[in-house]
């Protein structure tokens, strides 16, 4: 049925963009101009079936399963949800709805190669002599830093920070062999006569 002007405000003269019955040249927000007439856009999650006329409103239909539209639109086809391809190391982080796309992320131990997260690569490990400054996430790689004097890392790891050298002094021992960035100190008894 045709609705009252109060219900369908795009039928106001103002909406048609002109005065004295002239066709509109611009429409309000969430409207579009077609055949010299302002029609309502379809809301997110719906696609356009038919444009409005002088007597009918815009006809919209909800997007199907695995489809979405995330804006007010006049699209005649919904977009397909992104596929998180496990062969590329991807998994679903957030399932798509009729109004949002699926968000993919990487499997544990992997991170995205780009902001769009279209594929994944294995997190890098920090070599001996380096510790993890920042553990990798689904979207960023491991950040490594050299172990400073007083710290060491003797493993290749994507998780381990540099470890402090053992304090021989607290064990009533002395350093028999100096530590390096890759090795801990070796403690031993004090040699009194050197």
């Amino acid at each position: 049925d045709y609705k009252d002007d109060d219900d369908k405000d795009y039928k106001d003269d103002d909406d048609k963009g002109g005065s004295g019955g002239e066709p509109p040249t611009a429409c309000r927000e969430k409207q579009y101009l077609i055949n010299s007439q302002c029609c309502s856009l379809c809301q997110p999650g719906q696609k356009l079936v038919s444009d409005c006329t002088e007597f009918t409103e815009t006809e919209c239909l909800p997007c199907g399963e695995s489809e979405f539209l995330d804006t007010w639109n006049r699209e005649t086809h919904c977009h397909q949800h992104k596929y998180c391809d496990p062969n590329l190391g991807l998994r679903v982080q957030q399932k798509g709805t009729s109004e949002t796309d699926t968000i993919c992320t990487c499997e544990e131990g992997w991170h995205c190669t780009s902001e769009a997260c279209e594929s994944c690569v294995l997190h890098r490990s920090c070599s001996p002599g380096f510790g993890v400054k920042q553990i990798a996430t689904g979207v960023s790689d491991t950040i490594c830093e050299p172990c400073p004097v007083g710290f060491f890392s003797n493993v290749s790891s994507a998780f381990e920070k540099c470890h402090p050298w053992t304090s021989c002094e607290t064990k009533d021992l002395v350093v028999q062999q100096a530590g390096t960035n890759k090795t801990d100190v070796v403690c031993g008894p004090q040699d009194r006569l050197r």
């Epitope: 350093v175 062999q177 100096a178 031993g188």
Partner: antibody
Framework: QVQLQQSGAELMKPGASVKIPCKAT????????IEWVKQRPGHGLEWIGE????????NYNEKFKGKATFTADTSSNTAYMQLSSLTSEDSAVYYC???????????????WGQGTLVTVSA | DIVMSQSPSSLAVSVGEKVTMSCKSS????????????LAWYQQKPGQSPKLLIY???TRESGVPDRFTGSGSGTDFTLTISSVKAEDLAVYYC?????????FGGGTKLEIK
């Protein structure tokens, strides 16, 4: 208070060796690294290496391996640096120094000896 | 090896002036594990041994006048003397103790006009 006492000047012939002492007082000698630093005019300061007197453990700058040898005598609280096969490039002031902390946080040198001038000349 | 670069190599100022000198390292001296910068500053007056002024980039050594201030982080560091005195005539060296071998900058010679 902490003091590091070094010997005076040494005049050496090319090819000879010199052993520079650094006597420490005012702290537990065995527990702190002794650092050795070279200073040549126009060359700034160069770290040669370090020795921990309690164990004789050493760290050398690769550049000075084979040139410098560190030892320490805990009975006299004296650290030594021996320089071998002297050339004119070894003419410099050599300082011993001690870090503020014991051994595990990296070394800034809080205490310095007065330096030993080594001159190598035929 | 970590390379330490100081600038300027020399500068001449009048007593009472403010002085800043720069030290740059070829790699970061900031360790995230303790949020400390492994950098020290020394003063060497003519005919004397070097003297420690600053460690951990900004911690003033006991007894050092508060006109000496160290700042900076990562690879860029500055030593500032807020109001130079005649007795500050010296060469100033920075040193990294982040990794072996410990290395020094080439020094900045401060002369008094």
């Amino acid at each position: 208070q902490v003091q590091l006492q070094q010997s005076g000047a040494e005049l050496m012939k090319p090819g000879a060796s010199v052993k520079i002492p650094c006597k420490a007082t005012g702290y537990t000698f065995s527990s702190y690294w002794i650092e050795w630093v070279k200073q040549r005019p126009g060359h700034g300061l160069e770290w040669i290496g370090e020795v921990l007197p309690g164990s004789g453990s050493t760290n050398y700058n690769e550049k000075f391996k084979g040139k410098a040898t560190f030892t320490a005598d805990t009975s006299s609280n004296t650290a030594y640096m021996q320089l071998s096969s002297l050339t004119s490039e070894d003419s410099a002031v050599y300082y011993c120094a001690r870090p503020y902390y014991r051994y595990d946080v990296g070394a800034w040198f809080a205490y310095w000896g007065q330096g030993t001038l080594v001159t190598v000349s035929a | 090896d970590i390379v330490m670069s100081q600038s300027p190599s020399s500068l001449a100022v009048s007593v009472g002036e403010k002085v800043t000198m720069s030290c740059k390292s070829s790699q970061s001296l900031l360790y995230s594990g303790n949020q400390k910068n492994y950098l020290a500053w020394y003063q060497q007056k003519p005919g004397q041994s070097p003297k420690l002024l600053i460690y951990w980039a900004s911690t003033r050594e006991s007894g050092v006048p508060d006109r000496f201030t160290g700042s900076g982080s990562g690879t860029d560091f500055t030593l500032t003397i807020s109001s130079v005195k005649a007795e500050d005539l010296a060469v100033y060296y920075c040193q990294q103790y982040y990794s072996y071998p410990y290395t020094f900058g080439g020094g900045t010679k401060l002369e008094i006009k």
